[in-house]
Amino acid sequence: ELCDDDPPKITHATFKAVAYKEGTMLNCECKRGFRRIKSGSPYMLCTGNSSHSSWDNQCQCTSSAARNTTKQVTPQPEEQKERKTTEMQSQMQLADQVSLPGHCREPPPWENEATERIYHFVVGQTVYYQCVQGYRALHRGPAESVCKMTHGKTRWTQPQLICTGETEPSQFPGEEEPQASPDGLPESETSR
């Protein structure tokens, strides 16, 4: 069952998923000047069974210039920088590392993909938060959020994380910079 809304936003933090539960949608979004092809699903779907899951449908982007029934209105300013090659490589490495029953790995990037990935998560999905570069965790309980079903409604639990700015990165004594996700599992690129 799809979660009704997106995971909570934490100032100066991003969230990541280790793997994606079956039923998760990943919108086929394209970078500026490109749009998804007119035939094919508007999203990829994590589908399968308990022994094997994979992403159904493939996202494809095409140049927007050649579309006669598609118009482009005044573009909004770019909000994010291009995803770096190293980040793309880390995604592909992740695909070899994560294998959870009933879950899909991070899909590899597609040509002319947008800078931000937009997911529709399902009930039971956990996402993990970490502070962006230049900020550190000032107060940390579980830095994660879970989509739960309560009384027929979905809700995300509130992550216990505050990210504070600093001129030089530093940690509390004995606290490592939160690079790896809980349980030592590798983390994946996500929509925030």
Epitope: L2, D5, D6, G23, M25, N27, E29, C30, R32, R35, K38, S39, G40, S41, P42, Y43, L45, T47, D56, N57, S64, T69, T70, K71, Q72, V73, T74, P75, Q76, A114, E116, I118, H120, S191
Partner: antibody
Framework: QIQLQQSGAELVRPGTSVKMSCKAA????????IGWVKQRPGHGLEWIGD????????NYNEKFTGKATLTADTSSSTAYMQLSSLTSEDSAIYYC???????WGQGTLVTVSA | DIVMSQSQKFMSTSVGDRVSVTCKAS??????VAWYQQKPGQSPKALIY???YRYSGVPDRFTGSGSGTDFTLTISNVQSEDLAEYFC?????????FGGGTKLEIK
């Protein structure tokens, strides 16, 4: 809570235009396509087109090209649809829809009458 | 354009029964099909996406199945509140198209 709040009913004259709104709340407006659907009794549901507020892209069902104009204002998280050269055939309920058709507005009833 | 055909405009059933609403696409749409429920005077409500996945809050008595051109929405243990019109929709290619609807009547 995700909501799509549409503007109120319109009674308009043939040959004129009408512009209706769809205000989104509870999600990142610029991330998701907003579609528009027409419903007339006995004619079922018809997809008019959709707009990506962040990317600025618009798709029209060719049947509605020249009839419908879709716009969006990211600063107010509001999508708009203007219908022009109205005839009795345009009398219908118009719905906005977002987040891969998961969320629907309550609809705007347009009545075209002399 | 892809035509989505719901051959039965009306279906009659009793509380507790099992009923299947069918939808046929004029060409292969994979599993890119959604089902909606519309009660009188209300907006359509999304029930199923990708042919077989339920939206949140949708009772598990609603089940979607099918791929390619033939799709089915099955309602098991029909309840009185299921009195509504049911629409299928393909979103495999533009323009997205809907079926004509099937009205479920409770005896």
């Amino acid at each position: 809570q995700i909501q799509l709040q549409q503007s109120g009913a319109e009674l308009v004259r043939p040959g004129t235009s009408v512009k209706m709104s769809c205000k989104a709340a509870g999600y990142t407006f610029s991330n998701y396509w907003i579609g528009w659907v027409k419903q007339r009794p006995g004619h079922g549901l018809e997809w008019i087109g959709d707009i990506h507020p962040g990317g600025g892209y618009i798709n029209y069902n060719e049947k509605f090209t020249g009839k419908a104009t879709l716009t969006a204002d990211t600063s107010s998280s509001t999508a708009y649809m203007q219908l022009s050269s109205l005839t009795s055939e345009d009398s219908a309920i118009y719905y906005c829809v977002s987040r891969n058709f998961a969320n629907w507005g309550q609809g705007t009833l347009v009545t075209v009458s002399a | 354009d892809i035509v989505m055909s719901q051959s039965q405009k009306f279906m009659s059933t009793s509380v507790g029964d099992r009923v299947s609403v069918t939808c046929k696409a004029s060409q292969n749409v994979g599993t890119n099909v959604a089902w909606y429920q519309q009660k009188p005077g209300q907006s359509p409500k999304a029930l199923i996406y990708s042919a077989s996945y339920r939206y949140s809050g949708v009772p598990d008595r609603f089940t979607g199945s099918g791929s390619g051109t033939d799709f089915t929405l099955t309602i098991s243990n029909v309840q009185s509140e299921d009195l509504a019109e049911y629409f299928c929709q393909q979103y495999n290619s533009y323009p997205y198209t809907f079926g004509g609807g099937t009205k479920l009547e409770i005896k």
